[in-house]
């Protein structure tokens, strides 16, 4: 079966047909009838239920609401009710761009290694009993291949490979015709062995702070795609409320490693946090590093040498 | 020949009940959503249903001028869906239709429709 739709914040292009499937659906358990709800919320209107009296695009199954298609207007909040459980969704609905095949935000991008192995399959679960034919496009020139059901490239990668590849499937119901488009953006890379990971910049910092203030520890690496990078403070993480993890940036090189970093926030700086170790560490299958910050108070500074601070 | 047959309308005072029937003939009802429609008098029929039960039985969807008074369920071995109406109000008087689609949606994207049945609330 279809997984359900986990994630909270979803940005879909207009025209297409959607779908959000709550994730309460067991359907073994439900034996009797129950009695569930679809709202929407955007802006001015506050929760208005949704049923074809408020878009006749809707339908409604046991767990799934659907829209045919899915239009600029539907951008909102929307919220499934049964009983005494609750799901959350924020949609966010975009133009399409007519001038493409497809729609540069909604493209996902994937990184293969020359001469590895080179994948792309046209398939969609959910509307797949309605698809008609589904076509491969590649920088947005169709490809001509064999099964017009689920389209598929299997190679061993060239760089010729790189570029947008577009999967449309067409699909028919109650009598109109659709599409659904999903767009990968490949990218082809020299052979990357892996590297031992590196934080970059001084073992230990000592970084001038004031009480009452917040500072952000700014910690980076250049790592492998897989390895990863965590901040280690105090007794037990997460236990002093006014720290605070960022979430992690990460920004390909163009060598195929990648460029991370990740802040750890204090806030309204107290005693406790003064003269304390906050380590950032980056662990891979090779081993791991590990750098280190010292909040120091601005009036001690002069105990220790200038060379060592950072800002 | 296939069918949609609503039974069970007729005449019922403000605050009673009724209990409307929709029987299927030449197909099984059980692989479809039945959503239930009003048709006022001197209106058109409603595009949007007033109470729909999935195929499976499971989910039931209402509106919200009929939700905590109607009632919808469906018997697949009799192959029959009822609406049980309580606390009927005078503009509950309509003709009710009972049409079978893949899903609870709007009128245009049903496949088969009953005949209708009338359900009139005095005052």
């Known amino acids: 079966a279809e997984s359900c739709t986990s994630r909270p914040h979803i940005t879909v292009v207009e025209g297409e047909p959607f779908y959000l499937k709550h994730c309460s659906c067991s359907l073994a358990h439900e034996i009797e009838t129950t009695t569930k709800s679809w709202y929407k919320s955007s802006g001015s209107q506050e929760h208005v239920e949704l049923n074809p009296r408020s878009s006749s695009r809707i339908a409604l199954h046991d767990c799934v609401l659907e829209f045919w298609p899915v239009e600029l207007n539907d951008t909102g909040s929307y919220f499934f009710q049964m009983k005494n459980y609750t799901q959350k969704w924020k949609l966010n609905v975009i133009r399409r761009n007519k001038h493409s095949c497809f729609t540069e935000r909604q493209v996902t991008s994937k990184i293969v290694e020359v001469k590895k192995f080179f994948q792309i399959t046209c398939e969609n679960s959910y509307y797949q009993t309605l698809v008609n034919s589904t076509s491969l496009y590649k920088n947005c020139k169709k490809l001509l291949l064999e099964n017009n059901k689920n389209p598929t490239i299997k190679k061993n990668a060239e760089f010729e490979d790189q570029g947008y590849y577009s999967c449309v499937h067409f699909l028919h119901h109650n009598g109109k015709l659709f599409n659904i488009t999903k767009t990968f953006n490949i990218t082809i890379v020299e052979d990357r062995s892996n590297i031992v990971p590196v934080l970059l910049g001084p073992k230990l910092n000592h970084v001038a702070v004031e009480l009452g203030k917040n500072v952000r520890l700014n910690c980076s690496a250049l790592l492998n795609e897989e390895d990863v990078i965590y901040w280690m403070f105090g007794e037990e993480n997460g236990s002093d409320p006014n720290i605070h993890e960022e979430k992690e940036m990460r920004i390909m090189t163009p060598e195929g490693k990648w460029h991370a970093s990740k802040v750890l926030r204090i806030e309204n700086i107290g005693e406790s946090n003064l003269n304390v170790l906050y380590n950032c560490t980056v662990a891979s299958t090779g081993g791991t590093d590990t750098k280190s910050f010292i909040l120091v108070r601005k009036a001690d500074m002069a105990d220790i040498p200038g060379h060592v601070f950072t800002r | 020949d296939v069918q949609l047959q609503e039974s069970g309308g007729g005449l019922v005072q403000a605050g009673g009940s009724l209990r409307l029937s929709c029987a299927a003939s030449?197909?099984?009802?059980?692989?479809?959503?039945i959503n239930w429609f009003r048709q006022a008098p001197g209106k058109e029929r409603a595009r949007a249903w007033d109470?729909?039960?999935?195929?499976?039985?499971?989910?039931?969807y209402y509106a919200d001028s009929v939700k905590g008074r109607f009632t919808v369920s469906r018997d697949h071995a009799k192959n029959t869906v009822y609406l049980q109406m309580n606390s009927l109000k005078p503009e509950d008087t309509a003709f009710y239709y009972c049409?079978?689609?893949?899903?609870?949606?709007?009128?245009?994207?049903?496949?088969?429709w009953g005949k209708g049945t009338l359900v009139t609330v005095s005052s």
């Open positions: 109470a729909c039960i999935t195929s499976s039985g499971r989910s039931a």
């Open positions: 049409a079978a689609g893949a899903a609870c949606a709007a009128a245009g994207t049903m496949n088969y």
């Open positions: 030449g197909f099984t009802l059980g692989a479809y959503a």
